[in-house]
């Protein structure tokens, strides 16, 4: 996930936000799956 060649603060911010959103989605799916399996 290189997300381009720009290293300015805005590009870094957008990349960080994307990672947070992605992890939140993944963890949310895992949590829902655990609840569903109980």
């Amino acid at each position: 996930h290189s997300d381009g060649i720009f290293t300015d603060s805005y590009s870094r911010y957008r990349k960080q936000m994307a990672v947070k959103k992605y992890l939140a989605a993944v963890l949310g799916k895992r949590y829902k799956q655990r609840v569903k399996n109980k």
């Epitope: 290189s2 720009f6 805005y10 590009s11 957008r14 994307a18």
Partner: antibody, heavy 109, light 111 residues
């Protein structure tokens, strides 16, 4: 960068536009969509990260959806009105550093 | 959503002269410098000139420069050439990307 899928549609018809790339790996870049109505200015629609997470302009109101595979980025549009008539551009990076020629979407009854 | 207001069109310039285009945002851009400038000629897609308020994009001539911070930004073209006749747009990036927006554009006419 190349966009495709633009055509004449009637109001309310859904339409999907596709963006492909040559000379670089699309999967390594965030990609954005921008539109331009005939004779008007540029309008930012939204973008998609390499992780597949998306952000949209506040005016989109869930009518448009951006998604991606390893080789394409798509813009799915629903509830189209005549106001959505425009050339739709796909561009690379959050800073929109490389643009395609655009694909024309005409919404008319 | 943010509103970006640009210098009204058209702006006239003589070859060899200097052109200044202003872009004012209704709210501060991210980190006070998340602003880009684009050049668009008729029938062509836009081209990135400046990003992060003042950083020149790859391959862009040094006669283009950007400045400003927060809500007020400027694109300057020094030593204007005929090839610079185009419409110029600013794009603001914000803490909430839902606010991202372009300015209305400024047409530059070269005499």
């Amino acid at each position: 960068v190349e966009e495709s899928g633009g055509r004449l549609v009637t109001p309310g018809t859904p339409l999907t536009l596709t963006c492909t790339a040559s000379g670089f790996s699309l999967s390594s870049y965030a990609m954005g969509w921008v539109r331009q109505a005939p004779g008007k200015g540029l309008e930012w629609i939204g973008d998609i990260s390499t992780y597949g997470t998306t952000d949209y302009a506040s005016w989109v109101y869930g009518r448009f959806t951006i998604s991606r595979t390893s080789t394409t980025v798509t813009l799915k549009m629903t509830s189209l009105t005549t106001e959505d008539t425009a050339t739709y551009f796909c561009a690379r990076d959050y800073w929109l550093s490389l643009w395609g020629q655009g694909t024309l979407v005409t919404v008319s009854s | 959503a943010a509103v970006l207001t640009q210098t009204p069109s058209p702006v006239s310039a003589a070859v060899g002269g200097t052109v200044t285009i202003k872009c004012q945002s209704s709210q501060s851009v991210y980190d006070n410098n998340a602003l880009a400038w684009y050049q668009q000629k008729p029938g062509q897609p836009p081209k990135l000139l400046i990003y992060a308020a003042s950083t020149l994009a790859s391959g862009v001539p040094s006669r283009f420069s950007g400045s400003g911070s927060g809500t007020e930004f400027t694109l300057t073209i020094s030593g204007v050439q005929c090839d610079d006749a185009a419409t110029y747009y600013c794009l603001g990036g914000y803490y909430d990307p839902a606010d991202n927006a372009f300015g209305g554009g400024t047409e530059v006419v070269v005499k």
